[in-house]
Interface confidence: low
Amino acid sequence: HNTTVFQGVAGQSLQVSCPYDSMKHWGRRKAWCRQLGEKGPCQRVVSTHNLWLLSFLRRWNGSTAITDDTLGGTLTITLRNLQPHDAGLYQCQSLHGSEADTLRKVLVEVLADPLDHRDAGDLWFPGESESFEDAHVEHSISRSLLEGEIPFPPTSHHHHHH
């Protein structure tokens, strides 16, 4: 799975969308989980309504909400009052029995503000960085890792936007 990057501003809300094949995942509940380490488990944050037909109803766990458009095939997660510690790697999952299929891997980046105060020379554009070769950026521009910085998750150094 490619990793999709979503960037949000601290204190504001961030919406994450996970498209899927509505026929293939017909009748399945969905979940949003946080990846604990590169090879660690994905810890459940919130899941859709116990009754699949009511999946359109928004369910909250703390500041995180989930809602599922089962006909259109789009799972939407809302992170309200985004905080720096919300940054990290997450997954949208489709549940069947005790199993879970990954719909999308998501990297959440929390920006103190939409632009960094570093030089514009730190910017990179998709396709110009090997460090992000398995990630594409939604509505944002990020920068590659600094030398020596750990590559997991492939997070940018905070803030470039548009």
């Epitope: 501003v9 601290a10 204190g11 504001q12 946080r34 990846q35 604990l36 380490g37 905080q83 720096p84 510690h85 919300d86 940054a87 990290g88 790697l89 959440v108 103190a112 503000d113 939409p114 632009l115 960094d116 105060h117 570093r118 750990i150 997991f152 998750p153 997070t155 150094h157 905070h158 803030h159």
Partner: antibody
């Protein structure tokens, strides 16, 4: 060059209000949060809150809710902080600071003295 | 709120000496998602606003001399000045940059003999 120019010192009476300003230059004002920090004489720093000039969104330290109100004027690239119902406890230097990875840019500070 | 504790309020050293000051947070500042510690160090000289020295616990701000080094993870952090210069006379503050409300330590005043 990024600069934050704060308004001059204020001498105010207890119970009154004061509104200070922070004029930003050298960058796109609407692209960065502006934070406000209090420093009482000889004391540490206290984070008051921030405003996102692009949409006026704010976040406050619970301690300063009802005391401080943050606003901006986008056309003049100026952030404002109003303090109300002033007491001697509010006597301090107030800084505006532009955020990023930490607060890399600070205003010179506005000294507020509350005295009868 | 996260409480930041700088247990040493003042340190007196001779120019050229190495000095280390500590900062403890009441909860971890480590983001498990990106393995960064949201801890910032500032230097404040008399009559001036604070100056950013270190962000993410160990990343030196542009233009800051390399004699300043930040270390630590989780709840325990240090700022080391490898060879103190006369111009380093200042108060040093650590700050929780992890969650709102941002909070600062009480500061460590560095004095030169």
């Amino acid at each position: 060059e990024v600069q934050l120019q704060e308004s001059g010192p204020e001498l105010v009476k207890p119970g009154a209000s004061v509104k200070m300003s922070c004029k930003a230059s050298g960058y796109t004002f609407t692209d960065y949060n502006m934070h406000w920090v209090k420093q009482s004489h000889g004391k540490s720093l206290e984070w008051i809150g921030y405003i996102y000039p692009n949409n006026g969104g704010t976040g406050y330290n619970q301690k300063f809710k009802g005391k401080a109100t943050l606003t901006v004027n986008k056309s003049s690239s100026t952030a404002y902080m109003e303090l109300r119902s002033l007491t001697s406890e509010d006597s301090a230097v107030y800084y505006c600071a532009r955020s990023g990875r930490g607060f890399a840019y600070w205003g010179q500070g506005t000294l507020v003295t509350v005295s009868a | 709120d996260i409480v930041m504790t700088q247990s040493t309020s003042s340190l007196t050293v001779t120019a050229g000496e190495k000095v280390t000051m500590s900062c403890k947070s009441s909860q971890s500042l480590l983001n498990s998602g990106n393995q960064k510690n949201y801890l910032t160090w500032y230097q404040q000289k008399p009559g001036q606003p604070p100056k950013l020295l270190i962000y993410w616990a160990s990343s030196r701000e542009s233009g800051v001399p390399d004699r300043f080094t930040g270390r630590g993870s989780g709840t325990d952090f240090t700022l080391t000045i490898s060879s103190v210069q006369a111009e380093d006379l200042a108060v040093y503050y650590c700050q929780n940059d992890y969650s709102y409300p941002f909070t600062f330590g009480s500061g460590t005043k560095l004095e030169i003999k």
